[in-house]
Amino acid sequence: DLKVEMMAGGTQITPLNDNVTIFCNIFYSQPLNITSMGITWFWKSLTFDKEVKVFEFFGDHQEAFRPGAIVSPWRLKSGDASLRLPGIQLEEAGEYRCEVVVTPLKAQGTVQLEVVASPASRLLLDQVGMKENEDKYMCESSGFYPEAINITWEKQTQKFPHPIEISEDVITGPTIKNMDGTFNVTSCLKLNSSQEDPGTVYQCVVRHASLHTPLRSNFTLTAARHSLSETEKTDNFS
C-alpha cells in the first residue's frame, strides 16, 4: 500500500522571500528504493487554472523547472519527498501537488501554499494645517500581503486598568498596491491634546494574517505636547 501525507489542514503559510519546504511524506509497506521510484511536484496558480510542473525526480534523473527547486535524495530514502523552494514570491502561492510513483502504484496529495508579507509600521506626527491643541498622528503600515489588514487605535489612561479602543476621530485610508504586489495603508488619529490627560499612552495596533501578535507603535501624551516616546515593553517601529 502506498500513501502520501501533506501538511495537516491542507494549507501551509510562508513568509515572502523565505526558503519554504512544502511537506510531502511517503508511507509504503516496504523499504523505498529511490532508483525505482518517481516524484513529480506540480503547481497550480491562484489566478489561472493550469497546472505547471515544478520538479521531477526519476531514478538517477532530476530536473527543476522552477529555479532552485529541490527534493533531497537522502531524505527521499526515508520517505520524505518534501519540496524546497528558495526565495518564495507572492505569485508562487497556489496549489502544490506531490505525485509519487512506486511502480505499479501511484499516490498523490495536494496542499495550498499561502505567501504572506508582514507589515512594517511607523508613527508620524503631522501638525501641518492643524488648529492649536490639535494634533494628527499617522500610523503607516507598509509592505504587507494579503491586502486584508486591521488597524485600530487604543489609549491607556493612567487610572484605568485596561486599554480603551478609540473609534472617534480615526480615519483609515484606502490600501495602496505597491509595484511588488504588497500593500500600504495609513490610519490617522486626530487628538485634542488639551482634553487628554498627560501620561496617557496611545497605540496604533496593526493586526494582519502574517503576524502572530499585533504590531504596536506607541506615543505618550506629555505635558509638553507632541512628544513621541517609547514606552515600557513597546516595540517602536519609527
Epitope: 487610572k159 486598568p161 485596561h162 486599554p163 515593553k233
Partner: antibody
C-alpha cells in the same frame, strides 16, 4: 520586567490593624496608578481603592472608606494599604494591581490576611 | 455602582467542548469590559479587554463579544489548562466592579 511583590501573610485579632505592602520594580514607579483588590475565601473580587503613585491622589470604594488608608513611599517604590478595626469579614487575600499595556494588567502575588480571635 | 451579573456560576465541560460565559451589566458600559481567568491560589490573569480584544499571548480559542450591557466570553475548544474560574469586570467608571465568577470544571 514589571514585578509587584507583596508582604507575607498576616494573622490578626479582631479590632487590630494590618499594613500590607506592595513593592514595585521594573518601571517608572511614580507615573502609575495602583489599585487594591479584595478576594474573600471562595468569593469574587472587589475593588477597594487606588492611589496615584506620585502620592497626589487616592480614590476609595465607598464601602471601604474609614476602613482603609493607602500611602506611598516613592523612595522605596512601595505602596501600603492599612486596614483598621479588623473583623472576621476582613479575612481575605488582598492584591495590588497596576495597569498593564498589551499583556494585561499586573498583579502582586496576593497577601492573605486572617482575622481570628 | 454598576452591577455585573455573571452566568452560569458553575459549568461542567469536557476537553474539546465549546463554552460560553455571559455577563450582564446593570447599565450601559460601552465596550469597557475585561475578562479574567483565575486558577486556585493564583492571582487573576487578564484575557480580554475592550470586550473583544485579546491580550497578547492569550490563545485564539478565547474570544469576547458584546457591547452596552450584554457580554460573552467564548472558549472555542476547551484545553486541560482552561479549567479555572472566570470573571468579567467593567472599567468604564470607578468603583471597578466584577462579576461573581464562573467556575469551569471538568465533566
Amino acid at each position: 520586567q514589571v514585578q509587584l511583590v507583596q508582604s507575607g501573610a498576616e494573622v490578626k485579632k479582631p479590632g487590630a490593624s494590618v499594613k500590607v505592602s506592595c513593592k514595585a520594580s521594573g518601571y517608572t514607579f511614580t507615573s502609575y496608578w495602583m489599585n487594591w483588590m479584595k478576594q474573600a475565601p471562595g468569593q469574587g473580587l472587589e475593588w477597594i481603592g487606588g492611589i496615584y503613585l506620585s502620592g497626589e491622589s487616592t480614590d476609595y470604594n465607598e464601602k471601604f472608606k474609614g476602613k482603609v488608608t493607602m500611602t506611598v513611599d516613592t523612595s522605596t517604590s512601595t505602596v501600603y494599604m492599612e486596614l483598621s478595626s479588623l473583623r472576621s469579614e476582613d479575612t481575605a487575600v488582598y492584591y495590588c494591581t497596576r495597569r498593564g499595556d498589551y499583556f494585561g494588567d499586573f498583579w502582586g502575588q496576593g497577601t492573605l490576611v486572617t482575622v481570628s480571635s | 455602582d454598576i452591577q455585573m451579573t455573571q452566568s452560569p456560576s458553575s459549568l461542567s465541560a469536557s476537553v474539546g467542548d465549546r463554552v460560553t460565559i455571559t455577563c450582564k451589566a446593570s447599565q450601559n458600559v460601552g465596550k469597557y469590559v475585561a475578562w479574567y481567568q483565575q486558577k486556585p491560589g493564583k492571582a487573576p490573569k487578564s484575557l480580554i479587554y475592550s470586550a473583544s480584544n485579546r491580550y497578547d499571548g492569550v490563545p485564539s480559542r478565547f474570544s469576547g463579544s458584546g457591547s452596552g450591557t450584554d457580554f460573552t466570553l467564548t472558549i472555542s475548544s476547551l484545553q486541560p489548562e482552561d479549567f479555572a474560574t472566570y470573571f468579567c469586570q467593567q472599567y468604564i467608571s470607578y468603583p471597578l466592579t466584577f462579576g461573581a465568577g464562573t467556575k469551569l470544571e471538568i465533566k
